[in-house]
């Protein structure tokens, strides 16, 4: 293959591969907890946004989908499933509803929502 | 790697790989002819929509972007850059403007536009 071309992955079959991360958009609506469980069952996690550059494909995502960001009421911070804190200036967080979970919306927006509301979701698997 | 996982590609560096097709969304606005030239310079073509199943990632694309579909006034058909005719029921063609070129819009819509209008564009490379 040409030097300018490369393989991406490995990823679960029929997932999107971009800059060696794997993504899948799930069409069925689940609450945040069910969405998290679905991703975990596929050795993945809900979407984690860590870089506007490495994840610029997310700019053009239509609609809004559960991601792995949750509000920790005790200290008021937003953190990812892996326990890391949301970096400043990565997401524009907008309170659409009183809640402790967040939907990913295009152009790096995070919509605060009630965790029990059903929504579509994005799973992500980082390749090693 | 697990049997359920696989590599995707090969694709140009930092392109999106999905079901062994390569896609890139270009942010700068160009007219249809300039967009075509830009894709060709990268050994690719403007987006060709050939399968709702193999290209279901296109459902979730926000906004609208030049694709490789042009109107042939002599016979009234729509055809791709490679000369193949648009398959029926693949795209909902909507006349936004008098024109002979088409923009891809989410959920498999094609917006007819004047070819000289600048828009963002999608390049595609099919892997062998």
């Amino acid at each position: 293959i040409p030097l300018t071309e490369s393989y991406c992955g490995p990823c679960p079959k029929n997932w999107i591969c971009y800059k060696n991360n794997c993504y899948q958009f799930f069409n069925e609506s689940k609450n945040w907890y069910e969405s998290q469980a679905s991703c975990m069952s596929q050795n993945a996690s809900l979407l984690k946004v860590y870089s506007k550059e490495d994840q610029d494909l997310l700019k053009l995502v239509k609609s809004y989908h559960w991601m792995g960001l949750v509000h920790i009421p005790t200290n008021g911070s937003w953190q990812w499933e892996d326990g890391s804190i949301l970096s400043p200036n990565l997401l524009t967080i907008i309170e659409m509803q009183k809640g402790d979970c967040a939907l990913y919306a295009s152009s790096f927006k995070g919509y605060i929502e009630n965790c029990s509301i059903p929504n579509t979701y994005i799973c992500m698997q980082r390749t090693v | 790697i697990p049997l359920t996982e696989s590599y995707c590609g090969p694709c140009p560096k930092n392109w999106i790989c999905y079901k062994n097709n390569c896609y890139q969304f270009f942010n700068e606005s160009k007219n249809w002819y300039e967009s075509q030239a830009s894709c060709m310079s990268q050994n690719a073509s403007l987006l060709k929509v050939y399968s709702k199943e193999d290209q279901d990632l296109l459902k979730l694309v926000k906004s609208y972007h030049w694709m490789g579909l042009v109107h042939i006034p002599t016979n009234g058909s729509w055809q791709w850059e490679d000369g193949s005719i648009l398959s029926p029921n693949l795209l909902t063609i909507i006349e936004m403007q008098k024109g002979d070129c088409a923009l891809y819009a989410s959920s498999f819509k094609g917006y007819i536009e004047n070819c000289s209008i600048p828009n963002t564009y999608i390049c595609m490379q099919r892997t062998v």
Epitope: S63, T92, I93, E95, S106, S107, Y111, E113, I117 | S107
Partner: antibody
């Protein structure tokens, strides 16, 4: 491009319920949050509330006890109900989508509350 | 709720002049969650600026937004005849979302 069209009665009697519907021109009902905003004659704009395609609604506390916003994804429509109306509810009512802000608006429908 | 106060109430200017519109919030608007809209008589408002400074699609570059915290500004660098209208600011940093009372830009 998304187009929005409000519909409903232009005249409502005091103490009755105002009902409006907003029809979305394409299949984008599941792509955005959908809002209602009103503007009394010669005055400014007031956000009433919004709803997601899954039915999660948020209302302006000043109207919360009287307002219900619902969505019907199968018809590409969302609706506003405002109960126990008075003359103070006379306004142009707009529907709008929320993306980066209120990006796309309907043309508005004038509702007069009068007996 | 956050109260937005716009000034001046009316701005009388000639085409080609620069217009500066102010929007002051009663408390800090988090992360510059402020939008500007233009409304002409008998029409719906049109989004001009979001995120305090980002121009909406199709908005000419003579429109610019700036500011943070409690003080925001919409600037029209050279007024065109079609720019004479009422302008509203709106915050979406905290619920309920609120609008300013508007500034009318009229022909002098």
């Amino acid at each position: 491009q998304v187009h929005l069209q409000e519909s409903g009665p232009g005249l409502v009697k005091p103490s009755e319920t105002l009902s409006l519907t907003c029809t979305v021109s394409d299949d984008s009902i599941s792509s955005y949050y959908w809002s209602w905003i009103r503007q009394p004659p010669g005055k400014g704009l007031e956000w009433i509330g919004h709803i997601s395609y899954s039915g999660s609604a948020n209302y302006n506390p000043s109207l919360k006890s009287r307002v219900t916003i619902s969505v019907d994804t199968s018809k590409n429509q969302f609706s506003l109900k405002l109960s126990s109306v008075t003359a103070a509810d006379t306004a142009v009512y707009y529907c709008a989508n929320w993306d980066d802000a209120f990006n796309i608006w309907g043309q508005g429908t004038m509702v007069t509350v009068s007996s | 709720e956050i109260v937005l106060t716009q000034s001046p109430g009316t701005l009388s200017l000639s085409p080609g002049e620069r217009a500066t519109l102010s929007c002051r919030a009663s408390q800090s608007v988090s992360s510059s969650y402020l939008a500007w809209y233009q409304q002409k008589p008998g029409q719906a408002p049109r989004l001009l600026i979001y995120g305090a400074s980002s121009r909406a699609t199709g908005i000419p570059d003579r429109f610019s937004g700036s500011g943070s915290g409690t003080d925001f500004t919409l600037t029209i660098s050279r007024l065109e005849p079609e720019d004479f209208a009422v302008y509203y600011c709106q915050q979406y940093g905290s619920s309920p979302w609120t609008f300013g009372q508007g500034t009318k830009v009229e022909i002098k």
